[in-house]
């Protein structure tokens, strides 16, 4: 999915107003220290790409991301703002049901959602001049 | 805990170069921007600009270009600003700052350092 | 650039009522705007982000309403320690701006 023609202004506001609460409670009783972040991104089509990545796509040592709160509210926001996002995830989500598994919070997965925190970070300030 | 720790104070003569330090700790210092803001005696806050120690990227204001350079040492977590060809308009109280966890806010700041440019 | 305009520059207030300092911008900054209070001989501190956000330890007593390029941070009653220099802040477009900052005294 090309990412150009969301509504960033409304994508940013819905992640301030919740999204970030739900990654701060995940991360909860982790050391700010912890984790280095290693998935960088460039504008906000690019990071939103990297953000549905991540918190989408099933990744060895953690597989279960799409069925976090903040995970639903992303994809909420994606399907509101970004037009015709909603049909390119049917088939994912479909997919998706079939391997449902039980949600376990390991480290690996407190690392994937210490890097959404920071590709958000970038989203919401993009350091590029036009943004 | 998270702290932003910077170099003394300065005093230099006009037309010479000035490098002030920011070490920081109680973070992972490669994931959060540093900015860089001054305050001239009685005066406002005025933006320098930002780097990102993850990268090296920077975004600086236009009236600091050239003259201010943004860096940052991951081994030892520290950000620096350099600015040359000072100038008597360049007295100031410097403070680093840290982005917030929203990138939306400074939350962290330094203690500030003092550089006078005097002849 | 965009210009962030303060106004009142200095309000004195009786302990416990309320005060009220505006900031409007020169062209919209959409709800990119921070508050900063900066105490006597202190660095700035945070108070409010993206427009109505509390930062955490921040007294419900402040609040932050606004979009586009009128802007408000209110402190519904007044403390000695809220004394010191309030600054808001855009963050929308680059270079990033600050209001003049307004003064604000205890009478």
């Known amino acids: 999915y090309d990412f150009t023609n969301c509504d960033f202004e409304k994508i940013k506001a819905a992640y301030l107003s919740t999204i970030s609460k739900d990654l701060i409670t995940y991360m909860s009783g982790t050391k700010s220290t912890e984790f280095n972040n290693t998935v960088s991104c460039s504008n906000r089509p690019h990071c939103l790409t990297e953000i549905q990545s991540l918190t989408f796509n099933p990744t060895a040592g953690c597989a279960s991301l799409a069925k976090e709160m903040f995970a639903m509210k992303t994809k909420a926001a994606l399907a509101i703002w970004c037009p015709g996002y909603s049909e390119t995830q049917i088939n994912a989500t479909q997919a998706m049901k079939k391997r449902r598994k039980r949600k376990v919070t390991t480290n690996k997965c407190l690392e994937q959602v210490s890097q959404l925190q920071g590709l958000w970070r970038r989203f919401n300030r993009p350091l590029l001049k036009q943004q | 805990e998270v702290q932003l720790v910077q170099s003394g104070a300065e005093v230099k003569k006009p037309g010479s170069s000035v490098k002030v330090s920011c070490k920081a700790s109680g973070y992972t210092f490669s994931n959060y921007l540093i900015e860089w803001v001054r305050q001239a005696p009685g005066q406002g806050l005025e933006w320098i600009g930002v780097i990102d120690p993850g990268n090296g990227d920077t975004n600086y204001n236009e009236n600091f270009k050239g003259r201010a350079t943004l860096t940052a040492d991951k081994s030892t977590s520290t950000a620096y600003i350099e600015l040359s060809s000072l100038r008597s308009e360049d007295t100031a109280v410097y403070y680093c700052a840290r982005e917030d966890n929203t990138g939306t806010a400074f939350d962290y700041w330094g203690q500030g350092t003092t550089v006078t440019v005097s002849s | 650039d965009i210009v962030m305009t303060q106004t009142p520059l200095s309000l004195s207030v009786t302990p416990g009522q309320p005060a009220s300092i505006s900031c409007k911008a020169s062209q919209s900054v959409s709800s990119d705007v921070t508050w900063y209070l900066q105490k006597p001989g202190q660095s700035p501190q945070l108070l409010i982000y993206?427009?109505?956000n509390h930062y955490t330890g921040v007294p419900d007593r402040f609040s932050g309403s606004g979009s586009g390029t009128d802007f408000t941070l209110k402190i519904s009653r007044v403390e000695a320690e809220d004394v010191g220099v309030y600054y808001c802040q855009q963050h929308h477009r680059f270079p990033l701006t600050f209001g003049q900052g307004t003064k604000l005294e205890i009478k």
């Open positions: 993206y427009v109505s």
